[in-house]
Amino acid sequence: SGTTNTVAAYNLTWKSTNFKTILEWEPKPVNQVYTVQISTKSGDWKSKCFYTTDTECDLTDEIVKDVKQTYLARVFSYPAGNVESTGSAGEPLYENSPEFTPYLETNLGQPTIQSFEQVGTKVNVTVEDERTLVRRNNTFLSLRDVFGKDLIYTLYYWKSSSSGKKTAKTNTNEFLIDVDKGENYCFSVQAVIPSRTVNRKSTDSPVECMGQEKGEFREI
């Protein structure tokens, strides 16, 4: 019986947002399956997603163990199903992924404005501190817990009646800005890690405007 031809995986790509991390690859399998292995530079290869016909593997559980480590994955191809094959002691075909350092490379998810509160000519805008899948002492850490002061938020705000935008920055999750009395404002925020060279900014949050449910207004 002849040896089955398997095709090595290619286009191995890390897709990661707020540390939820999936390795994707091609091609869709025909008479073959894949197993993924992941390792740190100094560590052992750990098998995941055994003998799958998927072309993705969720590696979040592995990378959250130490988000500052650099990881490498590889995808093995095996013949499978009703195919002719002969036993072989050699390793199956595999392809390596690019290196991936979650802390430096995970995309920042779209932030959400949790609330805003006007007190006279001041507005306090609070950004939701999104929970990640990174754990410490059996509890999930927030984005702020993980990144600390490396993470800042930029607030874009403007009068509902005009298009001129102003900006503010904070290394917490709150802004306190001055506004004109009697004017309604709209807000949008963006997460930023200034020290990064790639994936520095998130997409902008959905716009929230005063006069809608999220806000609380107190005239002093």
Epitope: K46, K65, A80, N82, S85, P92
Partner: antibody
Framework: QVQLVQSGAEVKRPGSSVKVSCKAS????????MYWVRQAPGQGLEWIGQ????????NYNENFQGRVTITADKSTSTAYMELSSLTSEDSAVYFC???????????WGQGTLVTVSS | EIVLTQSPALLSLSPGERATLSCSAS?????MYWYQQKPGQAPRLLIQ???NLASGVPARFSGRGSGTDFTLTISSLEPEDFAVYYC?????????FGGGTKVEIK
Amino acid sequence: QVQLVQSGAEVKRPGSSVKVSCKASGYTFSSYWMYWVRQAPGQGLEWIGQIYPGDGDSNYNENFQGRVTITADKSTSTAYMELSSLTSEDSAVYFCTREGYGNRFAYWGQGTLVTVSS
Amino acid sequence: EIVLTQSPALLSLSPGERATLSCSASSSVSYMYWYQQKPGQAPRLLIQLTSNLASGVPARFSGRGSGTDFTLTISSLEPEDFAVYYCQQWSYNPPTFGGGTKVEIK
């Protein structure tokens, strides 16, 4: 070559615990999942659980949850399976087995007979 | 859990004959694995991922099937092939084994 050598036969009282060892050689112990499977006399095979020695990650068959603990000692390249609250139904041959290319039960230890009797 | 039913439970054949062993799954599974076990020994992997021969397994062994029905065929029985054969799945947790088919000398 890959070798898995298990500890010797054990006779235990009902309600007690047993700890079976599996010493690995011929490969990098911490790099491969190790599994435990048992076979009652004249019966089929039953998966108990598994461990990845590299980081201690483990998973168990729900049928054994709470009674079984699988550990690994990287310094001695040895995996352990401890089963507590033994009953006569736990009398079986216990095997350790290692993943290989294309299969998770590719290499097997010789088996350890555990007899539970009062 | 997935229940694997093997048939027949006992197969009495002579050396040189063809053996066909069946394994039926209670739900569709992706792949099947087959093991051979002789008295007093650990199981030995024969077939992985439905049809792939494990390293060192003679070409007289072959596997086929899909969904819920899988077969192991031994094209011409050799004296050393008389043993118990188990099928196994791990498409779903927990992994499960069939009850076994004993192939004995007629």
